[in-house]
């Protein structure tokens, strides 16, 4: 029950996280005009990964896409790449984890296969979260560097007669959304990995008892109860509980199909 809850919660947390990463990637407010200690302008500038926008006090907002690929800073391209990789990995992770959910039965899928899939999706979520956090952090670092550079030459002019106000940018809402979303995806991934350990079948011993009769020997293996709620008499790779007597004469051990460390 705890395993199912952990897995389910991990899935939900990751789902929220990936939705947040997608939202952050699409948002225009990665960097916003710094209004502190600045002359009061009637325009507010903000920028995203894909376009920059200007909102005027008139109520008019104008956005322009970055229609160049080669002309963009390498750091911006790197951030875009990290966010997209994070989204793709997260999306694949979600797809895998849906099939891995213990509460969902697909055919006669074994617990060991579900455990494998849970672990895979967990790792994908962790990498996805790390990609998002890295992308947002790289952008934030770029902003901080540019902020102090523009502060150093806040006003540039011709002989001090004419002043040009340099627009400084600070952290936008998308950065915080990205950090939180990346963190959630990471946490969800860790939860999935924890759930995987609970799902994995432990090394099972199938005990056999030999009854020695006169003339010939018959090996008797008691048929126990299936742990699965599935139908049918197919006991292949199912955990079987010992239900018969055992002797120490002849004990056979059958390791499970998949051993998890």
């Amino acid at each position: 029950m705890a395993v199912t809850a952990c897995q389910g919660l991990g899935f939900v947390v990751s789902l929220i996280g990936i939705a947040g990463i997608i939202a952050a990637t699409c948002m225009d407010q990665w960097s916003t005009q710094d209004l502190y200690n600045n002359p009061v302008t009637a325009v507010f500038n903000y920028q995203g990964l894909w376009r920059s926008c200007v909102r005027e006090s008139s109520g008019f907002t104008e956005c322009r896409g970055y229609f160049t690929l080669l002309g963009l800073p390498a750091m911006l391209q790197a951030v875009r790449a990290l966010m997209i990789v994070g989204i793709v990995l997260g999306a694949i992770g979600l797809l895998v984890s849906i099939f891995a959910l213990k509460c969902i039965r697909i055919g006669s899928m074994e617990d060991s296969a579900k455990a494998n899939m849970t672990l895979t999706s967990g790792i994908m979520f962790i990498v996805s979260g790390l990609c998002a956090i890295a992308g947002v952090s790289v952008f934030a670092n770029m902003l901080v560097t540019n902020f102090w550079m523009s502060t150093a030459n806040m006003y540039t002019g011709m002989g001090g007669m004419v002043q040009t106000v340099q627009t400084r940018y600070t952290f936008g809402a998308a950065l915080f959304v990205g950090w939180v979303a990346g963190g959630l995806t990471l946490i969800g991934g860790v939860m999935m990995c924890i759930a995987c350990r609970g799902l994995a079948p432990e090394e099972t011993n199938y005990k056999a008892v030999s009854y020695h009769a006169s003339g010939h020997s018959v090996a008797y293996k008691p048929g126990g109860f299936k742990a699965s709620t599935g139908f049918g008499s197919n006991t292949k790779n199912k955990k079987i509980y010992d239900g018969g007597a055992r002797t120490e004469d002849e004990v056979q051990s059958y390791p499970s199909k998949h051993d998890y460390v």
């Epitope: 005009q33 002359p39 009061v40 302008t41 009637a42 325009v43 500038n45 920028q47 920059s52 926008c53 200007v54 005027e56 006090s57 008139s58 109520g59 008019f60 104008e62 322009r64 004419v162 002043q163 040009t164 106000v165 340099q166 627009t167």
Partner: antibody, heavy 118, light 113 residues
Framework: EVQLVESGGGLVKPGGSLRLSCAAS????????MSWVRQAPGKGLEWVST????????YYPDSVRGRFTISRDNAKNSLYLQMNSLRAEDTAVYYC???????????WGQGTLVTVSS | DIVMTQSPDSLAVSLGERATINCKSS????????????LTWYQQKPGQPPKLLIY???TRESGVPDRFSGSGSGTDFTLTISSLQAEDVAVYYC?????????FGQGTKLEIK
């Protein structure tokens, strides 16, 4: 068609108060920034106040800050200018204007005359 | 506050001739975010409210004749009437629409010579 009609002007004594109104029609009032601009007799244009579109931030020049208050009632499609502690130099025709691209003012009312005199 | 200085204060031009009015601001009106200059030109005839001619320094308002054009960037701007018509007699104002307070130039009176 965009229409702006000012009202509330008149004669007032120095130190007195007056409330100007501007009735707007022909556009989605709440979406646009609105301004008051005045023109003293025989003089140039002077910007008095702006209330931005959407978030309704207000802005004033030093000459009127603390004395004038701009406000809007989006439900009534109305813009207001509350003028307190009026001075003789506040005598002017007050225009209500709607802003758009570049914070420019493409639409103006016909103006209302405010005279501050004892 | 931003100071807007227009020149000349008055201008007399013959019909059909070119009229040029200059406007200088004490600070750059260029917004780096969209590379637009927040300068507006208005025309005001006696007894009428001002009429918008040009916004963003060079974008003509719809309905304004194409003989009116705006140019310039940063701190120096120009309004040009390529071929003066009788109905163009008016006072012309430039306005800073970038910094608060939104300041107007003192106006340039355009007359027919």
């Amino acid at each position: 068609e965009v229409q702006l009609v000012e009202s509330g002007g008149g004669l007032v004594k120095p130190g007195g108060s007056l409330r100007l109104s501007c009735a707007a029609s022909g556009f989605t009032f709440s979406s646009y920034g609105m301004s008051w601009v005045r023109q003293a007799p025989g003089k140039g244009l002077e910007w008095v106040s702006t209330i931005s579109g959407g978030d309704s931030y207000t802005y004033y020049p030093d000459s009127v800050r603390g004395r004038f208050t701009i406000s809007r009632d989006n439900a009534k499609n109305s813009l207001y200018l509350q003028m307190n502690s009026l001075r003789a130099e506040d005598t002017a025709v007050y225009y209500c204007a709607r802003s758009y691209n570049g914070n420019s003012l493409p639409y103006w009312g016909q103006g209302t005359l405010v005279t501050v005199s004892s | 506050d931003i100071v807007m200085t227009q020149s000349p204060d008055s201008l007399a031009v013959s019909l059909g001739e070119r009229a040029t009015i200059n406007c200088k601001s004490s600070q750059s009106l260029l917004n780096s975010g969209n590379q637009r200059n927040y300068l507006t030109w208005y025309q005001q005839k006696p007894g009428q409210p001002p009429k918008l001619l040009i916004y963003w320094a060079s974008t003509r308002e719809s309905g304004v004749p194409d003989r009116f054009s705006g140019s310039g960037s940063g701190t120096d701007f120009t309004l040009t009437i390529s071929s003066l018509q009788a109905e163009d007699v008016a006072v012309y104002y430039c306005q800073n629409n970038y910094f608060y307070p939104f300041t107007f130039g003192q106006g340039t009176k355009l007359e027919i010579k």
